[in-house]
Amino acid sequence: DSSKWNIEHPGTIYAWEGACVWVPCTYRVLDGALETFILFHNPEYNQNMSKFEGTRLYESTKDGKLPSGQKRVQFLGNKINNNCTLSIHPVHVNDSGQLGLRMVSKTEKWMERIHLNVSERPFPPRIQLPPKLQESQEVTLTCLLNFSCYGYQIQLQWLLEGVPMRQAAVTLTSLSTKSVFTRSELKFSPQWSHHGKIVTCELHDVDGKVLSEDMVQLNVKHTPKLTIEVTPNETTVRKGDSVTMTCKVNSSNPEYTTVSWLKDGIPLKEQNTLMLTLHKVTKSQSGRYCCRVSNDVGPATSEKVFLQVQYAPESSRVQISQSPAVEGSEVNFLCISPANPLPTNYTWYHNGKEVQGRTEKQFQIQKILPWHAGTYSCEAENILGIGERGPGTELDVQYPPKKVTMVIENPTPIREGDTVTLSCNYSSSNPIVNHYEWRPRGAWEEPSLGVLKIQNIGWNNTAVACAACNNWCSWASPVTLNVLYAPRGVRVRKIKPLSEIHSGNSVSLQCDFSSSHPKEVQFFWEKNGSLLGKESQLNFDSISPEDAGSYSCWVNNSIGQTASKAWTLEVLYAPRRLRVSMSQGNQVMEGKTATLICESDANPPVYSYAWFDWNNQSLPYSGRMLRLEPVKVQHSGAYWCQGTNRVGKGHSPLITLTVYYSPQTIGRR
């Protein structure tokens, strides 16, 4: 049943006597695995026997091993990967015919036929050309040979007129179940000179022997190939001479259809033959002549013939590479004066005066300067005479404003807060100055062009610069305004000790200021409105808590005085002046409450208290208040307290508490 089998192979395999064949083959069977494979040569089906008969080239065994048999026939497939590829090496003419692949599975049988065509001699390859070859259009030439075999090496070689072609060919080999072939592809740009030439594709064996070949004649379509001849030979003529030009068509495929003549690229009217005659030439007939001949491929133009009609220089004109030109740029002047032959000598004029040493068509100034501005004209000379000097061309040289300076219009000195007027001046400019710029930029008033008014000038307006601007800005050297102002940034700074101030320390305070103009200053120190000193430093040899407070310093110069922010001087000291106070008095009746309070003066405040009795025994109380409740007669005695902060300790003097009996106690007794 054919629907159960799917076998792929090229169908027909071509070879020649002594070569080999390689038959790529794959199969699929829907029902079970392939059990038996037999390769027949020209199999015939015997109806009576219900089986195929013929020469058996190969037969598989149960275990898939190859039997001894035809050595030149090799079955290269296997059952595992469904491959049925085979080869015959060498192959002979009488191998031509059908190869029958008999395939048997558990339930199905199939006979697949492959045609084998073995010729006596190597058959030629086939050259395939594109339908149209046109000059300079790259095409691919293909040489196809319906043969490929792993055991037999071949080569395809290209020749043009019997000479190997230099272009690199690409050879493709196919040994697939779809097709078996060897193909050589050659990229080729045909030239008109290739027209009618023979291209050969040769089939070579491994030793380079030519086995067969195919030849084609190239039909390269091309535009006409032209040459032009002039009579008389000389193309330099005088006005009134006659000239004949002949257009020769050396090759054309297909034949040419039209002819025309061009002068300086423009077609000449009613000139459509291969010969052009110019009678009594005039100056205007000088130019480049060529003929144009067309065929179906397209038009072709001959080389140009430069016909020169000689005449003396005409009135000159000067062409300037740039005007206006920027100062410092390169400027080229060109003297244009039609003449034939070309002028050999030029004379240049600047504002009517001859420029010495300049005798060429082009006059170059590498770096143009303001004084180069003006009118430039020239005269040209050739063997036929000197031309007329034209009217000249104007050169404008532009440059930034020159010698820009700035002037302070104010009487000096300038004080902070004054109104200052500045003017910006320059010596020359091209184009004219159209605006001014100022540095630094500020919300300043410009009452007139080039004048700047700074209202309420700041202390730090040190330097101002102006620029006069046309297309460019030229800056003046900055002018220092020298603004006078009272001292700034006044502050009190502790210079010693570096850490916190403890009672008894040596202390120095510095009166700092960031700037002052003028520089000469005086200092004043005050505390709570009282003047302390007139130096930049305020020194305490041994600071006491009484020195703590709010300090300010003043710095003054001839313009004014400036005070610092108040600076608080804090002195740290151990608890002092401790005393024990009793809110209820120092005589208390038993049974009542006795409250003792430890009073102290300390910075920072006391964080820990201790209480002691008359025997210096520590009492189990640690607060500022010692409460005895109910108080007993035995509590009578002297008490003292001790206070501690992070600077140190202090203790109070003794204070006596007297506890007397209550009337009840006295009554009981």
Epitope: G328, Q356, Q364
Partner: antibody, heavy 123, light 106 residues
Framework: QVTLKESGPGILQSSQTLSLTCSFS??????????VSWIRQPSGKGLEWLAH???????RYNPSLKSRLTISKDTSRNQVFLKITSVDTADTATYYC???????????????WGQGTTLTVSS | DIQMTQSPASLSASVGETVTITCRAS??????LAWYQQKQGKSPQLLVH???TLADGVPSRFSGSGSGTQYSLKINSLQPEDFGSYYC????????FGGGTKLEIK
């Protein structure tokens, strides 16, 4: 009165960078067309032009030394500078700065020269 | 680029003689040529600019001439102070200075 004066280190080691200063007076390098060149002369040899700077800060260099040279100016301080990188014993020479005055057309020449500063490069 | 070729490289002459030093440019330099004199241990000094204009203070025995590509410096009646090296220079050529001519006392 136009004067130019060169100053430099006198002695350098190979591979160091040479810094030269030309201080001038009597003219301004902001004047149109004005320029200053550096020229050197190895002992007993000819003049070798190195670099030129114009009033407009355009700079020209000797092509064979261009990669090693940097010319600059400070117009306000009337100074021109030349830096030569990676010096070698072949750079041992007297170094001159010279003024090129504004030309009529394009004919730059040197009308005033400094006295020269000597450089010795030791390996 | 224009090249400057100065000749001769050296020259011996006596006081009172006339000598000529030439400078050839590989292209037209339009008269923009200068000549310098350098004495031993001194800076070069400008003698001539624009091919033929004598610099201020230069004695009239010195003269420059030429055009296009050929230029020369002529010293009439050589004086003892004229001995030294002479250089031609065209700013736009590379290099701008000629190789120099050493003028020595014979």
């Amino acid at each position: 009165q136009v004067t130019l004066k060169e100053s430099g280190p006198g002695i350098l080691q190979s591979s160091q960078t040479l810094s030269l200063t030309c201080s001038f007076s009597g003219f301004s390098l902001s004047t149109s067309g004005m320029g200053v060149s550096w020229i050197r002369q190895p002992s007993g040899k000819g003049l070798e032009w190195l670099a030129h700077i114009y009033w407009d800060d355009d700079k020209r260099y000797n092509p064979s030394l261009k990669s090693r040279l940097t010319i600059s100016k400070d117009t306000s301080r009337n100074q021109v500078f030349l830096k030569i990188t990676s010096v070698d014993t072949a750079d041992t020479a007297t170094y001159y700065c010279a003024r090129a005055p504004p030309p009529n057309w394009d004919e730059y020449y040197f009308d005033y020269w400094g006295q020269g500063t000597t450089l010795t490069v030791s390996s | 680029d224009i090249q400057m070729t100065q000749s001769p490289a050296s020259l011996s002459a006596s006081v009172g003689e006339t000598v000529t030093i030439t400078c050839r440019a590989s292209g037209n330099i339009h008269n923009s040529l200068a000549w310098y004199q350098q004495k031993q241990g001194k800076s070069p000094q400008l003698l001539v600019h624009n091919a033929k204009t004598l610099a201020d203070g230069v004695p009239s025995r010195f003269s420059g001439s030429g055009s296009g590509t050929q230029y020369s410096l002529k010293i009439n009646s050589l004086q003892p102070e004229d001995f030294g090296s002479y250089y031609c220079q065209h700013f736009w050529s590379t290099p701008p200075f000629g190789g120099g001519t050493k003028l020595e006392i014979k």
